[in-house]
């Protein structure tokens, strides 16, 4: 942590970017009859950042503080006025007390100054403690941020794993779908072949029936022909002729039937062969189908196990994500409480600085009263510029690399009976 020594006025400009009079005195505020103290406007401070999300809330706090400071300053002014009355009273007895005053100047600072010095030491000590505490809290915050990053990374890794598993599953599903489509296609092809067999059977049945009908018709015709010859003696010769003819016709018919039947048998054999081939093909397809079904079943098994694995992985992931979420919530709570604590410390710190500033001004006032001169009260520049306190920046990032620069202008006006007798300006540059 970088330490800086800054004056009370500079400290104000570090905390807030608003215009601020030294000690919160409004310009032109009367210190007493014949005397007025004013300070020139300070240049705006360098851009600053307070690295907290609560900065906005604190800003409102600072505004309230400024208001209370103004009230305190008004009260102090009133006290100044009463002190000046006392000084006037002392002026009347100036000669009597001059020696005593000289004696007091020569001496060590009063016991009152010692008391304030002791208080200041105590305040500085508290400030140092707060600074150390703030540094420790920052380290803790960094550690928490690191833990959070680790948890987030772990969560990301788990998510990646899950996505990978899902992609694998999608690929397996696609393979299973393709196998199913192949099986369905094969089934359709087998059914197509079986359909052809059904038609072939029908065609075969019809051909056989047709041939049987033809055969039956021919037999009736032959029987009629055979029954024709007349048995009368007169036609014996004709009968023998007819018998010879009938005999040869019978042979021809038989021959014709035989050849026709042979054709039929051939056709039947051909059809039977076609049927056998079709059945053989169907069996081949069935075998292929069985093997494909086996493949499909094994794929289904793989698929199911993968789905089971994925479910388990998802459950595990959900559980882990829940625990991460809890841890995250816990960390965020802790972070929030740390932020609140930091804000509290910052507030305390601010209050202490306010008290300290008030004390600084009061000490300066007392010192001036003790060093009071005969005709007027003037406040040398050194009084304010030498009042130095220690302060530690809460966040090194929030102070820019360049030095803080400010001008303090002390304007001294001497008035008598409402008229300005003497006016002087002194400019003091501070570089941090």
């Amino acid at each position: 942590m970088e330490r800086r020594r800054i004056t009370s006025a500079a400290r104000r400009s570090y905390v807030s970017s608003g215009e601020m009079m030294v000690g919160g005195l409004a310009p032109g505020r009367r210190l007493g009859p014949g005397t007025r103290l004013s300070l020139a406007r300070m240049p705006p401070p360098l851009p600053t950042r307070v690295d907290f999300s609560l900065a906005g809330a604190l800003n409102a706090g600072f505004k309230e503080t400024r208001a209370s400071e103004r009230a305190e300053m008004m009260e102090l002014n009133d006290r100044f006025a009463s002190y000046i009355e006392k000084v006037r009273f002392l002026e009347q007895q100036n000669k009597a007390l001059a020696a005593e005053l000289n004696q007091l100047r020569a001496k060590e600072p009063t016991k009152l100054a010692d008391v304030y010095q002791a208080e200041l030491r105590e305040l500085r000590l508290r400030l140092d403690q707060l600074t150390a505490n703030s540094a420790r809290l920052e380290v803790e915050r960094d550690n928490l941020a690191q833990d959070l990053a680790t948890v987030r990374q772990k969560l990301q890794d788990e998510t990646n794993l899950r996505l990978e598993a899902e992609n694998n599953l999608a690929a397996y599903r696609q393979e299973a779908d393709e196998a199913t489509l192949a099986r369905l296609d094969l089934e359709r092809k087998i059914e197509s072949l079986e359909e052809e067999i059904r038609f072939l059977r029908k065609i075969h049945e019809e051909e056989v029936r047709e041939l049987q009908e033809q055969l039956a018709r021919q037999q009736v015709h032959v029987e009629l022909d055979v029954a024709k010859p007349d048995l009368t003696a007169a036609l014996k010769e004709i009968r023998t002729q007819y018998e010879a003819m009938a005999s040869s016709n019978m042979h021809e018919a038989e021959e014709w039937y035989r050849s026709k039947f042979a054709d039929l048998t051939d056709a039947a054999a051909r059809n039977a062969e076609l049927l056998r081939q079709a059945k053989h093909e169907a069996n081949d397809y069935r075998r292929q189908l069985q093997s494909l079904t086996c493949d499909l079943e094994s794929l289904r098994g793989t698929n199911e196990s993968l789905e089971r694995q994925m479910r388990e992985q998802e459950e595990r992931h959900v559980r882990e994500a829940a625990s991460y979420q809890e841890a995250l919530a816990r960390l965020e709570e802790e972070g929030q409480s740390l932020k609140d604590e930091m804000a509290r410390h910052l507030q305390e710190y601010q209050d202490l600085l306010n008290v300290k500033l008030a004390l600084d001004i009061e000490i300066a006032t007392y010192r001036k009263l003790l060093e009071g001169e005969e005709n007027r009260i003037t406040i040398p520049v050194q009084t304010f510029s030498n009042l130095q306190i220690r302060e530690t920046s809460l966040d090194t990032k929030s102070v820019s690399e360049g030095h803080l620069k400010r001008n303090i202008v002390v304007k001294t006006v001497e008035m008598r009976d409402g008229e300005v007798i003497k006016e002087s300006k002194q400019e003091h540059k501070d570089v941090m």
Partner: antibody
Framework: EVQLVESGGGLVKPGGSLKLSCAAS????????MHWVRQAPEKGLEWIAY????????YYADTVKGRFTISRDNAKNTLFLQMTSLRSEDTAMYYC????????WGQGTSVTVSS | DVVMTQTPLSLPVSLGDQASISCRSS???????????LHWYLQKPGQSPKLLIY???NRFSGVPDRFSGSGSGTDFTLKISRVEAEDLGVYFC?????????FGSGTKLEIK
């Protein structure tokens, strides 16, 4: 996507002829048997003809036997139905359909036989 | 030829109701390989028929699960668990066990 698109229908006089076509796509046409089915106006469906994948087996309904001829060109993925000696009772919407379950049908082509 | 008889011819329903259509064949539709080639189609006005259920109870691709088929031998049923507006049209049953293939006369599903 399986698609069957019939064409060739129209108005014809009794005794006249028409040749219907059915263009197939989206499946292995040469692997499946194909059918023609018709539907007379406001009537039911009537199966009329079958041809096997390799054209070796052909079968017709009795109502069209001897008048209609089914054929296919596997190289062109096309099914045909040559209709001759058309009668008024042949007036119908003609659909081609694939496979034993008639799983895919075309949108149909209308044939009107009228003098 | 196998005759397919569908009942009822018309089925008025309210949207969200269950609907049931029956189909009876003149012969058993169980083929020698054990399969039963009974299918259900829906034809919406001005469109071609679309396959819903094949081989008694298998839903065709893209068909909602509110459609289900059941039955065996010669008696079959198509059920729609909750009728939606898009389900309105004419439902046909068909058999491809026996050649020639034959269709039922159709059942018109309409709003009550």
């Amino acid at each position: 996507e399986v698609q069957l698109v019939e064409s060739g229908g129209g108005l014809v006089k009794p005794g006249g002829s028409l040749k219907l076509s059915c263009a197939a796509s989206g499946f292995t046409f040469s692997a499946y048997g194909m059918h023609w089915v018709r539907q007379a106006p406001e009537k039911g469906l009537e199966w009329i003809a079958y041809i096997s994948s390799g054209s070796s087996t052909i079968y017709y309904a009795d109502t069209v036997k001897g008048r209609f001829t089914i054929s296919r060109d596997n190289a062109k993925n096309t099914l045909f139905l040559q209709m001759t000696s058309l009668r008024s009772e042949d007036t119908a919407m003609y659909y081609c359909a694939s496979s034993y379950a008639l799983d895919y049908w075309g949108q149909g082509t209308s044939v009107t036989v009228s003098s | 030829d196998v005759v397919m008889t569908q009942t009822p011819l018309s089925l008025p329903v309210s949207l969200g109701d269950q609907a049931s259509i029956s189909c009876r064949s003149s012969q058993s539709l169980v083929y020698s390989n054990g399969n039963t080639y009974l299918h259900w189609y829906l034809q919406k006005p001005g469109q071609s028929p679309k396959l819903l259920i094949y081989k008694v109870s298998n839903r065709f691709s893209g068909v909602p699960d509110r459609f289900s088929g059941s039955g065996s031998g010669t008696d079959f049923t198509l059920k729609i668990s909750r009728v939606e507006a898009e389900d309105l049209g004419v439902y046909f049953c068909s058999q491809s066990t026996h050649v020639p293939y034959t269709f039922g006369s159709g059942t018109k599903l309409e709003i009550k």
